[in-house]
């Protein structure tokens, strides 16, 4: 909501999760792994990489089925705490200028830092308009105090807010699982919010920094290394 059409393939780590229709976004973090939101879990997912217009085959797409879908063991479907999942692709993505991985964070998100949010979610705060072309939004990370004041009792240490307290610009339904990137690092995963782009109701995002060890450990535990003797 309140964003702009991204330059084509300018967000090469952005993926669309498809189950017959686009239902969530995600981020490519290595040639064979995607990170998304825990509440985007489905038993069968096709990961669509290199997408810009999700309704048109433009020639840069890679459609790869999920081989493993691993939701965080402490994901809470009622509070959306630990709202993160990992998808292992059934075959590695072909990395090129239009499909490439985003780095995991080396430090937690800092208030005031500019970030890029992207997705194919609803672009209207009142009504519904689902775009075909990838939308981008530049938005600042808010302080934890501002975040908690916006949602008293709802914000855990695994969440942070990004956006504008005055409203007007935000992620929305269909953006979940997608990236929040600051300084070339995946800081957030689109998670939830009361409405979209409402005053004093900024978007709430999963704090990826808290899960770097889990991500690395999970990838290691689910990677098959062949040892030749």
């Amino acid at each position: 909501v309140g964003g702009y059409i991204c330059e084509e393939n300018s967000v090469p780590y952005q993926v669309s999760l498809n189950s017959g229709y686009h239902f969530c976004g995600g981020s490519l973090i290595s040639e064979q792994w995607v990170v998304s939101a825990g509440h985007c879990y489905k038993s069968r997912i096709q990961v669509r990489l290199g997408e810009h217009n999700i309704e048109v085959l433009e020639g840069n797409e890679q459609f790869i089925n999920a081989a493993k879908i691993i939701r965080h063991p402490k994901y809470n479907s009622r509070t959306l705490d630990n709202d993160i999942l990992l998808i292992k692709l059934s075959s590695p993505a072909v990395i090129n200028s239009r499909v490439s991985a985003i780095s995991l964070p080396t430090a937690p998100p800092a208030a005031g830092t500019e970030s890029l949010i992207s997705g194919w979610g609803n672009t209207l705060s009142s009504g519904a308009d689902y775009p075909d072309e990838l939308q981008c939004l530049d938005a600042p990370v808010l302080s934890q105090a501002e975040c908690e004041a916006s949602y008293p009792g709802k914000i855990t240490n695994n969440m942070f807010c990004v956006g504008f307290l005055e409203g007007g610009k935000d992620s929305c339904q269909g953006d979940a699982g997608g990236p929040v990137v600051s300084n070339g690092e995946l800081q957030g995963i689109v998670s939830w919010g009361y409405g979209c782009a409402q005053k004093n109701r900024p978007g709430v995002y999963t704090k990826v920094y808290n899960y770097v060890d889990w991500i690395k450990d999970t990838i290691a535990a689910n990677s098959h290394h062949h040892h030749h003797h």
Epitope: F23, C40, S43, K154, W192
Partner: antibody
Framework: QVQLQESGPGLVKPSETLSLTCTVS????????WHWIRQPAGKGLEWIGR???????FYNPSLKSRVTMSVDTSKNQFSLKLSSVTAADTAVYYC????????????????????WGQGTTVTVSS | DIQMTQSPSSLSASVGDRVTITCQAS??????LNWYQQKPGKAPKLLIY???NLETGVPSRFSGSGSGTDFTFTISSLQPEDIATYYC????????FGGGTKVEIK
């Protein structure tokens, strides 16, 4: 605690439009998805559709051509219209709240219902 | 459409008995399965969400399990107040309910 109350005509003529309203009290309508469900006498439950206050709706594919849902946040109400009714639409109609705390998770998916109205009986007859 | 097949359609058991109801989905729905209790003339009440999570305030004698296509709902020790019809509900793709299981006391 949140309470839901369905209201509307108990009798609708065939081919006309059934109109029902659900009033939400004890909480804000803007923090959840909201559903309509119906149940013919002695039969099972059928989901009609859901709405949230952005106006975004999802309808049961089998009823989609006849269903319209709307929301009035100023009155804390949401509504159902079902057009071209027949005797097969005779049922108890329930409104319900989505079970997720937030109702605003930003995926495109579905949940269940944790708070229900008591239901209102609608009979389609001439 | 995802079809939900519940069985049995009705059962009769004694107070204190263990009661089991099954629900089968026509395709894999992961754990997006809820269970409801409906007493005559009343609205349904959520008991179990996401296949196995007990809703707040619901007695611990109710439980759910399963994933994929096969799900089970159990009342560990049937009580007189448990007389009702129980419904499963999938939320993986739109929402559909099972046909219901009517539970009676012998």
């Amino acid at each position: 605690q949140v309470q839901l109350q369905e209201s509307g005509p108990g009798l609708v003529k065939p081919s006309e439009t059934l109109s029902l309203t659900c009033t939400v009290s004890g909480g804000s309508i803007s923090s959840h998805y909201w559903h309509w469900i119906r149940q013919p006498a002695g039969k099972g439950l059928e989901w009609i559709g859901r709405i949230h206050t952005s106006g975004s709706t999802f309808y049961n594919p089998s009823l989609k051509s006849r269903v319209t849902m709307s929301v009035d946040t100023s009155k804390n109400q949401f509504s159902l219209k079902l057009s071209s009714v027949t005797a097969a639409d005779t049922a108890v109609y329930y409104c319900a709240r989505d079970l997720t705390n937030y109702g605003w998770s930003k995926s495109i998916r579905f949940y269940g219902m944790d708070v229900w109205g008591q239901g209102t009986t609608v009979t389609v007859s001439s | 459409d995802i079809q939900m097949t519940q069985s049995p359609s009705s059962l009769s058991a004694s107070v204190g008995d263990r009661v089991t109801i099954t629900c089968q989905a026509s395709q894999d729905i992961s754990n997006y399965l809820n269970w409801y209790q409906q007493k005559p003339g009343k609205a349904p009440k959520l008991l179990i969400y996401d296949a196995s999570n007990l809703e707040t305030g619901v007695p611990s004698r109710f439980s759910g399990s399963g994933s994929g296509t096969d799900f089970t709902f159990t009342i560990s020790s049937l009580q007189p107040e448990d007389i009702a019809t129980y419904y499963c509900q999938q939320t993986d793709n739109f929402i559909t309910f099972g046909g219901g299981t009517k539970v009676e006391i012998k």
